[in-house]
Interface confidence: low
């Protein structure tokens, strides 16, 4: 009977860590000589298994090749890794008396595709916080997957975003692959509670995509609106001033009251009010003793938010000498905000 080496499967797919069987059958036991498994072709091919009784980690023959009539030279590879990917050949040799064994026939080859799961996607954003209306880039990276086919999608609050660029490397054949994708997002003032999600779908994930999340609260700065108002006096010789910083994020806020340009009180906010959109409000009260001020006084509320230039709001209080009623003071807000760039 004519010798024929048959590898029935052109390819097999196996998840990393699992086992796979590479089938090989012969039609004849003649001529006498060994059967060997190789990965690859040509001079650089790698000997994988030779049925010579030696111990090879992770590889076993499927049938008992010591039996005289055995024609099944299939092997099982256990705990497969991406490095095991490649084309495996079952090769029949003829035993030489003095010269080396001669290769007489090879099977058609079986390609092993190792299915390796992608790593959980990591989403990175800009180093510095952006402001509403600014367009910022987020990058999603996942690595170590195989095969190369992979789907990556971006979402912001449930809405799909189209990436600027998505690349899978390397472009050629490799044991495993990496993906990198960049998306452009327009920040808006309501984004403190928003999330940008990178979703990776791959054959190894069984319809359960992996997600990487970037909370936009880590990448956005919403500057406060600052207002100074006068409250109704609590007694005849007191004026209550209120400085309100509204809708800011993050929490980092310093508030200073000044009288005629001199620091009067440092207010380190502790109890901030949180809005439903994730931003904060803060109100600082400043009690002015009118009897202590005969001249006009400019009270300034200076707000420094997240190491940004200070926002200032002025409020002028007319002195005791201007008042016809000795128990009251007149106040005039200065609506012009000045920005202190120091």
């Amino acid at each position: 009977k004519e010798l024929k080496v048959t590898q029935p499967e052109k390819s097999v797919s196996v998840a990393a860590g699992d086992s796979t069987v590479l089938n090989c059958t012969l039609t004849s036991l003649l001529p006498v000589g060994p059967i060997r498994w190789y990965r690859g072709v040509g001079p650089s091919r790698l000997l994988i298994y030779s049925f010579a009784g030696e111990y090879v980690p992770r590889i076993r023959n499927v049938s008992d090749t010591t039996k005289r009539n055995n024609m099944d030279f299939s092997i099982r590879i256990s705990n497969v890794t991406p490095a095991d990917a490649g084309i495996y050949y079952c090769v029949k040799f003829q035993k030489g008396s003095s010269e080396p064994d001669t290769e007489i026939q090879s099977g058609g080859g079986t390609e092993v595709y190792v299915l390796a799961k992608p790593s959980p996607p990591e989403v990175s954003g800009p180093a510095d916080r952006g402001i509403p209306d600014q367009k910022v880039n987020f990058t999603c990276k996942s690595h170590g997957f195989s095969p190369r086919n992979i789907t990556l999608k971006w979402f912001k609050d449930g809405q799909e975003l189209h990436p600027l660029e998505t690349t899978v490397n390397p472009s050629g054949k490799n044991v495993s692959y990496n993906i990198s994708s960049t998306v452009r997002v327009v920040l808006n003032s309501m984004d403190v509670n928003s999330k940008v999600i990178c979703e990776v779908a791959h054959i190894t994930l069984d319809r359960s995509p992996l997600r990487g999340i970037a909370n936009l609260s880590n990448f956005i700065r919403v500057s406060p609106t600052v207002k100074v108002t006068q409250q109704s006096p609590t007694s005849m010789n007191q004026v209550n001033l209120t400085c309100r910083a509204e809708r800011f994020y993050p929490e980092d806020l310093q508030l200073i009251w000044l009288e005629n340009g001199n620091v009067s009180r440092n207010d380190t906010p502790k109890n901030l009010t949180k809005n439903t959109d994730g931003t904060y409000n803060y109100t600082s009260l400043f009690l002015v003793n009118s009897s202590a001020h005969r001249e006009d006084v400019v009270f300034t509320c200076q707000v420094k938010h997240d190491q940004q230039p200070a926002i200032t709001r002025n409020h002028t209080v007319l002195g005791f000498a201007h008042s016809s009623d000795q128990g009251s003071m007149q106040t005039f807000p200065d609506n012009n905000a000045t920005h202190n760039w120091n």
């Epitope: 209306d133 600014q134 367009k135 880039n137 189209h162 990436p163 452009r184 327009v186």
Partner: antibody, heavy 119, light 107 residues
């Protein structure tokens, strides 16, 4: 409504730097929501996107020109600019500036300015 | 870069005819495609954005369709003022790229 106007020399010598400015009127360049782009068109040919800038910083360039292109913005003058270094005759073209909406195309264009590279 | 292939490169049609231009992207660009009209000596004008949305002030005889790699631009009834070159442009992947253009003439 927003209008764009390109300005700059119509003739540039080879190896020199081409400099163009686009002035935005009828709206603020820093109001957000738009990219400000440069596009060119070689004589009798199609359109080539050069690059775009957002008022607060991000800039994108066409890789084929990236080594020679600089796009910048001056919000105080409501202008954005293009510089193309080491020009050759192949850079002779009509240069357009345009406003690009986030997902709504280049909806406002300047009338274009012809730049000839010749000694 | 994404290659945008427009066809035909030129066409001649009669007033009132239906005119169709196609644009093919070298890979999937979803619906991230715009169409522009350029008359001689003038700047391009946006007609269609996001493959099928009519830009403000553009007559309803212009329309666009398609998604993925194949797109179509249609003038339902050609008018004399429609004599121009039409370009498709993708904005799915940097750099933005344009088709080679289709010159439309009246017979």
């Amino acid at each position: 409504q927003v209008q764009l106007q390109e300005s700059g020399p119509g003739l540039v010598k080879p190896s020199q730097t081409l400099s163009l400015t686009c002035t935005v009127s009828g709206g603020s360049i820093s109001s957000g929501g738009y990219y400000w782009s440069w596009i060119r068109q070689h004589p009798g040919k199609g359109l080539e996107w050069i690059g775009a800038i957002y008022y607060s910083g991000p800039i994108y360039y066409n890789p084929s020109l990236k080594s020679r292109v600089t796009i910048s913005v001056d919000t105080s003058k409501n202008q954005f600019s293009l510089k193309l270094s080491s020009v050759t005759a192949a850079d002779t073209a009509v240069y357009y500036c345009a406003r690009e909406g986030y997902h709504s195309g280049m909806d406002v264009w300047g009338q274009g300015t012809t730049v000839t590279v010749s000694s | 870069d994404i290659q945008m292939t427009q066809s035909p490169s030129s066409l001649s049609a009669s007033v009132g005819d239906r005119v169709t231009i196609t644009c093919q992207a070298s890979q999937d660009i979803s619906n991230y495609l715009n169409w522009y009209q350029q008359k001689p000596g003038k700047a391009p004008k946006l007609l269609i954005y996001d493959a099928s949305n009519l830009a403000t002030g553009v007559p309803s005889r212009f329309s666009g369709s398609g998604s993925g790699t194949d797109f179509t631009f249609t003038i339902s009834s050609l008018q004399p003022e429609d004599i121009a070159t039409y370009y498709c442009q993708q904005f799915a992947y940097l750099p933005w790229t344009f088709g080679g253009g289709t010159k439309v003439e009246i017979k």
